[in-house]
Every structure is written in C-alpha cells, then in structure tokens.
C-alpha cells in the first residue's frame, strides 16, 4: 500500500523510450536524446554554491522505481520527477526545489574536538 505523500514511479512501457537529456547524456546519445527501458526524468538540485541546476535524461528500469520516489535527503535540496507516457515526456516536467527549512540555516556540520 502506498503511504500518503509518497509518489510512485509511472508504469514502465513495453518498448524503448526516448528521452531528452541535458547534463546527463550517455555516450550513445544523439541530438540530446537517450534511450531507456525505464523512465525519463528531470531533476533540480543545488550545486555547491547554492545555485539550482536542472538535469534531465534516462533512468534504466532497474532501481529507477526507488530513484523516482524522490525520498528527501537531509541537508540536500533536490527534487526529481519521472515519466513514461510518451517519448521526450520529460520536456514537460518542471520539478521545483523543496522549500528551505529554518534548521537548514542553522544546522551545520558537527565538528568533534
């Protein structure tokens, strides 16, 4: 049973899926198109300087159900959306960064003397 607030990955297709790729194109991609047995994705995350970076591409079927669930990671602002309903469907995905929590400002790395 799906828990409230948990998004599951879309249904896999019975055939190869073409996806737009950006910053995440495999070596076999042509014209920024990759192919997969799994999902297309678009992801937004903060880089080291706190700027939002959008990447998109292909996720293989194996393990992608977990990756597409977008489980929150402490101290990492990141959001991913996945799709399979049509080729290049990730062109229309627009994930947004989760809001900053107050403690994100104050919680720094813990240093032990």
């Amino acid at each position: 049973k799906k828990e409230d607030g948990e998004s599951t990955a879309p249904t896999p297709r019975p055939k190869v899926l073409r996806c737009k790729c950006h910053h995440h194109c495999p070596e076999d991609s042509v014209n920024n198109i990759c192919s997969t047995d799994g999902y297309c994705f678009t992801m937004i995350e903060e880089d080291d300087s706190g700027l939002p970076v959008v990447t998109s591409g292909c996720l293989g079927l194996e393990g992608s159900d977990f990756q597409c669930r977008d489980t929150p990671i402490p101290h990492q602002r990141r959001s991913i959306e996945c799709c399979t309903e049509r080729n290049e469907c990730n062109k229309d995905l627009h994930p947004t960064l989760p809001p900053l929590k107050n403690r994100d400002f104050v919680d720094g790395p813990i240093h032990h003397r």
């Epitope: 019975p14 055939k15 190869v16 073409r18 495999p26 076999d28 192919s35 293989g60 049509r86 080729n87």
Partner: antibody, heavy 117, light 113 residues
Framework: QVQLQQPGAELVMPGASVKLSCKAS????????MHWVKQRPGQGLEWIGE????????TYNQKFKDKATLTVDKSSSTAYMQLINLTSEDSAVYYC??????????WGQGTALTVSS | DIVMTQSPSSLAMSVGQKVTMSCKSS????????????LAWYQQKPGQSPKLLVY???TRESGVPDRFIGSGSGTDFTLTISSVQAEDLADYFC?????????FGGGTKLEIK
C-alpha cells in the same frame, strides 16, 4: 501471428511522390515502434527512420529527412511512408519492420518501388 | 554514424561444415550501464525479407535453430553456424542499435557447395 502486410510493387514517374503502406496485425500496434528500411540490389540495407505509433514520435536518418515522411493511422493499424521528388536512386525494395528494443523482430515482405518514365 | 563491416563478402560451404562470419563496428557497441552489446544478426533468403536470428550479440531469437550462435563484444562480433544445412543458403547481415542512425553491415552471402 504477427504480420506486416505491404503491397508487392509500385511504379511511379520521376519527380512524383508515393505513399507506401504497411498494415500491422496480430499484435497491439501502439506497443511497438515501426521502422522503414531501404534495400537496393547489391547495396545492403539502409535505415530510413522510425515512428512510435502511440505518440507519433519520429526519428529520421539525416540522409532521408528531406525524402521521407513517416505517419500512422492508429484506427487501421497502418504505418505509412511518403517519399517525395522521386528519382531513379529511389528505386529499391522498401521494408517496414517492427521493434520493441531497436532490433527488428518482424519484417514486412517489402514493396518494390520502381521510378521510371 | 557507426560503420559496420562484414567479412567475407561471400563464402561457399558444404552441408555439415562449420561456418563463421565476422562483423566489425567502427566503435564499441557495449553499453556500460547494462554490459550488453547492441548488435543483431539477420538472415535473408533469396526473394524474402530479412529474419531476426540473434540480438544483444548472443541471444538467439525464439524459434531459431541452435546451430546459429552469436558471439563477440565491443567492436568484434561473429555469427557461427555449427553445422550448415542446405536451407541456410542466404545473405547474413549484422546491425548495430547502439546509436542512431541504426546501421547495417554490407552482408555475407552464404552459398552451399
């Protein structure tokens, strides 16, 4: 059983256009890609392009992008390829072929296109 | 575009002999994410359309006799017919489906002595 039915032959005049057909049966048409392949005597096989019938998404071999246009009619499970500005170089056998994962598991019998006045 | 080169262009064998034909690609067809080689072999008998024999370099298509054996990895591939039969008279083509445009080798014509 899976079948891809193509007309046996077409004869057209130079400069004209032709629309080749490929009627699919024995499987769910939208669950597979359809490809078109050209074969000239002694010149092997050339991939022209592909179409996904479910969303009509196409990819073309750059060599054929100004020559061929791929379409489908989902209601009749038929794929089409239109060829324009025909010359003797376009005389060949044209096959439609089905794929799920980019290798071609079923082929039509081919249409022999002759361009001649 | 990936160039596929087949050799020999033709060969004549007697029934019962072992046949090997080669297919070389201008770049590797091995995908690192799944360690599969994106190469297929087809048989085309005179006056007929091509028929799939082998995909992913070594997986025999359902219904294909087990005398047809695909092998190889990276850029060098082989189709072996362990004991050739009269009905194997045909042209044999390899095809890469690693990167578009999908390309075919020039073919090997098998004649029966």
């Amino acid at each position: 059983q899976v079948q891809l039915q193509q007309p046996g032959a077409e004869l057209v005049m130079p400069g004209a256009s032709v629309k080749l057909s490929c009627k699919a049966s024995g499987y769910t048409f939208t669950n597979y890609w359809m490809h078109w392949v050209k074969q000239r005597p002694g010149q092997g096989l050339e991939w022209i392009g592909e179409i996904d019938p479910s969303d009509v998404y196409t990819t073309y071999n750059q060599k054929f992008k100004d020559k061929a246009t791929l379409t489908v009619d989902k209601s009749s499970s038929t794929a089409y390829m239109q060829l324009i500005n025909l010359t003797s170089e376009d005389s060949a056998v044209y096959y439609c072929a089905r794929s799920g994962w980019d290798y071609f598991d079923y082929w039509g019998q081919g249409t022999a296109l002759t361009v001649s006045s | 575009d990936i160039v596929m080169t087949q050799s020999p262009s033709s060969l004549a064998m007697s029934v019962g002999q072992k046949v090997t034909m080669s297919c070389k690609s201008s770049q590797s067809l091995l995908k690192s994410n799944n360690q599969k080689n994106y190469l297929a072999w087809y048989q085309q008998k005179p006056g007929q359309s091509p028929k799939l024999l082998v995909y992913f370099a070594s997986t025999r298509e359902s219904g294909v006799p087990d005398r047809f054996i695909g092998s190889g990895s990276g850029t060098d591939f082989t189709l072996t017919i362990s004991s050739v039969q009269a009905e194997d008279l045909a042209d044999y083509f390899c095809q890469q489906y690693y990167s578009t445009p999908w390309t075919f080798g020039g073919g090997t014509k098998l004649e029966i002595k």
